[in-house]
């Protein structure tokens, strides 16, 4: 689709005759019959295949025609075909005197026609206009023309249609030779994909419009290159969505359980070593002089009374040390400075000199003791109630009350430790006089069967693809490390062929 | 392709069991952990047991301690979780599912869940 333009601008009749020679009275008043048809070698008479148009009067005689295409239209003149320009045509321009108003072919005399001239070749579509100049022996015509396409058609024969535009169906304006060309931001042969945020994850990621990158399910980030976790993985990451692979010290499906406890945690005090004991668990070996579960005790060296006779006992850095109470001497206060000339003996006790008498020793009479005999005698001062049993007197005779766990008159035996069930990984419990026993089945040692002996579950070379193998301590089984490109138990999956989810 | 399917959920009154099944296909059976999840309506997902692949290590969670069994047939690539004492509180859906190595820790392939409701 397409417009053929004539521009008319000079045509010259001096003598202001017809073409039959007659003059026109009282001038030539000429208009302008325009025809526009298919190519012929001999330009004939017939139908304006192409189309045909006429002017009103633009002049007398000799005149300039002025360029009206602002004011109406009418010049340059507007030959419109909706169909594919041929890149041929050929031209009638026929000059005409009305001596009246009405310019209808059936409304003039036959000899009104002033000039005719017929011209055909070839007109490529473009915006350059060609000038040509007909002229006969008593006419001249000058006027230019050309063939553009209508809007929105494009191409070397005005045949390619194409609208700009900006909505769902499309984003773009129209090249010269009637292409898309997309506007920024879109790409798709008719521009209605956009192009996301650069780095966009392509599978991962998407886009309703240009610069944006909105992530698919399980899929997070900017860039919609970070799978979501397992919902309530704890200490975990992903590969793949709804993944949760421990992070290292962890355990349990959703990774909230502590393997690594002495790490995360340091609960041992005083310099005493840790020891990862299973989920959340760990035992504290203490450095001499501590005790508790953590070492948080510090023990002091007078809790054993090593002053004697009444000595008191002070803590020190490097141990301890004994303040003797007069006239006693010695490491422990143990040696005496009296003799039994000083009578030293109470409660009725008999003195024996020893050492030459250099010193003394007091036999004391029943219910009495101490170095003078100075104490009614404590029958727990001996602490007979053992494992931490507390000693009542009650007159002549004592009592043990036990702490929980144990049992007898001395808190000597202990309440079956076995009920607890403190074997791991399978042990049999025994029951002994000191406390308990456990016997561990193969592959576990320790007091309590918690310690794995090694097995080399990686011996048979289970992973392939040349992933690196471990033997995992708390299963007795291998893991496997794959190589970047590999995954499953044993590496034997290539990334190429990823799992699939039931969701 | 691994897949993990759950069965023998339902409605179960209080004080009342139920046995789940896990069927397992896909991958080498012997060679993976499976475990159990749970997950009730508002609520994030709680891991409730696992056993190794060899089943000579299973664990618990506190909640279910005592109540809940969990075992395996190697055989029959298939886990089981057997449920006692049910309280309303075990109201959830129960999912199987395997860290994709023998020892428990962490998720790797999850299957469709079963729902098992404790009610009067």
């Known amino acids: 689709s397409g417009v053929f333009q004539l521009q008319l601008q000079e045509f010259v009749n001096e003598r202001g005759v017809l073409a039959s020679g007659r003059p026109c009275e009282p001038g030539c008043r000429t208009f302008f019959r325009v025809c526009l048809k298919h190519f012929q070698a001999v330009v004939s008479p017939g139908p304006c295949t192409f189309g045909s148009v006429s002017t009103p009067v633009l002049g007398t005689n000799s005149f300039a025609v002025r360029d009206d295409s602002s004011g109406g239209g009418r010049n340059p003149l507007q030959l419109p075909f909706n169909f594919t320009w041929p890149g041929t045509f050929s031209l009638i321009i026929e000059a005409w005197h009305a001596p009246g108003d009405d310019l209808r072919p059936e409304a003039l005399p036959p000899d009104a026609l002033i000039s005719k001239i017929a011209i055909q070749g070839s007109l490529a579509v473009g915006q350059n206009w060609l000038l040509d100049e007909q002229t006969s022996t008593l006419t001249r015509l000058r006027y230019s023309y050309r063939v553009i396409c209508s809007d929105n058609y494009y191409g070397d024969n005005c045949s390619r249609l194409c609208k700009k535009r900006n909505d769902h169906f499309g984003h773009y304006v129209c090249q010269p030779d009637g292409n898309l060309s997309c506007l920024p931001g879109w790409t798709g042969e008719y521009c209605q994909q956009p192009i996301c945020l650069s780095g966009c994850h392509e599978q991962n990621g998407y886009c309703s419009k240009p610069a944006e990158c909105l992530c698919r399910p399980g899929w997070q980030g900017r860039l919609c290159n970070e799978c979501i976790p397992h919902n309530g993985c704890r200490h975990g990451t992903c590969s793949t969505p709804w993944q949760c692979t421990c992070d290292e010290g962890w355990g349990g499906l959703f990774c909230d359980q502590d393997l690594n406890y002495c790490t995360h945690h340091s609960p041992c005090k005083n310099g005493a070593t840790c020891s990862n004991s299973g989920q959340r668990s760990y035992t504290c070996t203490c450095r001499p002089g501590y005790t508790g579960v953590d070492c948080e005790l510090e023990l002091s060296e007078c809790d054993s009374n090593p002053c004697r006779n009444g000595g008191s006992c002070k803590d020190q850095e490097d141990g301890y040390h004994c303040l003797c109470p007069p006239g006693y001497y010695g490491l422990h206060c143990e040696h005496s400075t009296l003799s039994c000339a000083d009578s030293p003996c109470f409660n009725g006790g008999s003195c024996r000199e020893r050492n030459q008498g250099a010193s003394y020793a007091c036999e004391c009479p029943p219910n009495f003791t101490g170095s003078n005999c100075e104490k009614k005698v404590d029958r727990c001062t001996s602490n007979p109630c053992a494992n931490g049993g507390q000693c009542l007197n009650r007159g002549p005779s004592r009592m043990c009350r036990c702490r929980p766990g144990f049992t007898g008159t001395y808190c000597e035996r202990h309440v079956s430790d076995c009920a607890r069930n403190p074997c791991a990984h399978g042990g049999t419990c025994h029951d002994l006089e000191s406390g308990l026993m456990c016997t561990c089945p193969a592959g576990f040692s320790g007091r309590r069967c918690e310690v794995r002996t090694s097995i080399d579950a990686c011996a048979s070379s289970p992973c392939f693809n040349r992933a690196t193998c471990y033997t995992d301590l708390s299963t007795d089984t291998f893991v496997c490390n794959c190589p970047y490109g590999f995954v499953g138990s044993r590496c034997e999956f290539p990334v190429g062929l990823p799992p699939s989810f039931p969701w | 392709e691994v897949q993990l399917v759950e069965s023998g959920g339902g409605l179960v009154q209080p004080g009342g069991s139920l046995r789940l099944s896990c069927a397992a296909s896909?991958?080498?059976?012997?060679?993976?952990?499976i475990g159990w999840f749970r997950q009730a309506p508002g609520k994030e997902p709680e891991g409730i047991s696992c056993i190794s692949s060899s089943g000579g290590i299973t664990y618990y969670a506190d909640s279910v301690k005592g109540r809940f069994t969990t075992s395996r047939d190697n055989a029959k690539n298939t886990v089981y979780l057997q449920m006692n004492s049910l309280k309303p509180e075990d109201t959830a859906v129960y999912y199987c599912?395997?860290?994709?190595?023998?020892?428990?820790?962490?998720?790797?392939?999850t299957g469709q869940g079963t729902q098992v409701t404790v009610s009067s």
């Open positions: 599912a395997t860290p994709g190595i023998a020892a428990c820790r962490g998720i790797h392939y």
């Open positions: 896909g991958f080498t059976f012997d060679d993976y952990a």
